[in-house]
Interface confidence: low
């Protein structure tokens, strides 16, 4: 499946919007920093296959979308930027889901993929638990925003490597 040429550009736009969403200086939230255990090995392995990579990317974007379309998220961010950010994510989900479906149809998604998807789900469970424990404070959201920027950046790198493989 070929992702649209605009897809990498969409990713960069998503990252730019997420950067603009910052409301407080990260340096004022140093005490709230947390290691969420991003499953980096699922995104930077040189041996990855294209089909599982796409479905893991889809899971990552889906989880980010779920996280930022909650009422707690709505209260935390500028509404224009949040709307644009979530709409960008949504478009990416459209692109990726079409690919996931195509790969499934031609039987290219091996079972080993399930572990990678589970790792992403657990990562977001840790993020949600952290926000709950911190009572969705502004600093907690800032820490999560920075973390999502990092994970989105890594996923963008993976998508660009996928494109070079085509």
């Amino acid at each position: 499946c070929d992702l649209p040429e605009t897809h990498s550009l969409d990713n960069r736009r998503t990252l730019m919007l997420l950067a603009q969403m910052s409301r407080i200086s990260p340096s004022s939230c140093l005490m709230d920093r947390h290691d969420f255990g991003f499953p980096q090995e699922e995104f930077d392995g040189n041996q990855f296959q294209k089909a599982p990579a796409i479905s893991v990317l889809h899971e990552l974007i889906q989880q980010i979308f779920n996280l930022f379309t909650t009422k707690d998220s709505s209260a935390a961010w500028d509404e224009d930027l949040l709307d644009k950010f979530c709409t960008e994510l949504y478009q990416q989900l459209n692109d990726l889901e079409a690919c996931v479906m195509q790969e499934e149809r031609v039987g290219e998604t091996p079972l080993m993929n399930a572990d990678s998807i589970l790792a992403v789900k657990k990562y977001f469970r840790r993020i949600t638990l952290y926000l709950t424990e911190k009572k969705y404070s502004p600093c907690a959201w800032e820490v999560v925003r920075a973390e999502i920027m990092r994970s989105l950046s890594l996923s963008t790198n993976l998508q660009e490597r996928l494109r070079r493989k085509e």
Partner: antibody
Framework: DVQLLQSGGGLIQPGGSLRLSCAAS????????MSWVRQAPGKGLEWVSV????????DYVDSVKGRFTVSRDNSNNTLFLQMDGLRADDTAIYYC????????????????WGQGTLVSVSS | DIQMTQFPSTLSASVGDSVTITCRAS??????LAWYQQKPGKAPKLLIY???RLENGVPSRFSGSGSGTEFTLTIGSLQPDDFATYYC???????FGQGTKVEIK
């Protein structure tokens, strides 16, 4: 209780213009993206347009792009649909609809609807 | 654009029957699907959202299932008030199915 009260429909000649309004109450209007949905006589439902909470993001079904404009006035809790260059196939009952979920222009279904207003385009 | 194919277009049933309506998407829509009930001269009413979640106040005889491209709405035991037209709607690009009219046999 959520209420969406519509006005502005009527009989109009092809090429004419109409402006539909939808006055919202019973919920925090500015927190929700809003949509318009239409239903031609005896036919099914067709989504027409969506507008984000602030009004900065809009989208339309292809058949009305360039002719219809959706807008909102958050200070008066009102949604609008400006319809220009009306055609016979625009004849329908138009509904404004509130999504179940707040935030983005991707609603998890419409949980509240206006009473509908008939737009009839005929010469 | 994503097309939604809903079938059957008409369904004849009796009170107490269990009925199933199917909606098929032309491409995967995850679980982003809603079901509505509409009676003549009235606005649609949300029954199910996110594929399988029951809207507040909707009787438990209504249930939704499916994800990806195939979805079903089941009415467990048809009541007189359930004779109406039912629509599915995907909210990736917001299109509706053509509708299924459930009528008295």
């Amino acid at each position: 209780d959520v209420q969406l009260l519509q006005s502005g429909g009527g009989l109009i000649q092809p090429g004419g213009s109409l402006r539909l309004s939808c006055a919202a109450s019973g919920f925090t209007f500015k927190d929700y993206a809003m949509s318009w949905v239409r239903q031609a006589p005896g036919k099914g439902l067709e989504w027409v347009s969506v507008i984000s909470r602030s009004g900065n993001i809009v989208d339309y079904v292809d058949s009305v792009k360039g002719r219809f404009t959706v807008s909102r006035d958050n200070s008066n809790n009102t949604l609008f649909l400006q319809m220009d260059g009306l055609r016979a196939d625009d004849t329908a009952i138009y509904y404004c609809a509130k999504p179940k979920d707040m935030i983005v222009v991707v609603p998890a279904g419409f949980d509240s609807w206006g009473q509908g207003t008939l737009v009839s385009v005929s010469s | 654009d994503i097309q939604m194919t809903q079938f059957p277009s008409t369904l004849s049933a009796s009170v107490g029957d269990s009925v199933t309506i199917t909606c098929r998407a032309s491409q995967s829509i995850s679980a982003w699907l809603a079901w509505y009930q509409q009676k003549p001269g009235k606005a649609p009413k949300l029954l199910i959202y996110k594929g399988s979640r029951l809207e507040n106040g909707v009787p438990s005889r209504f249930s939704g299932s499916g994800s990806g491209t195939e979805f079903t709405l089941t009415i467990g035991s048809l009541q007189p008030d359930d004779f109406a037209t039912y629509y599915c709607q995907q909210y990736k690009t917001w299109t509706f199915g053509q509708g299924t009219k459930v009528e008295i046999k």
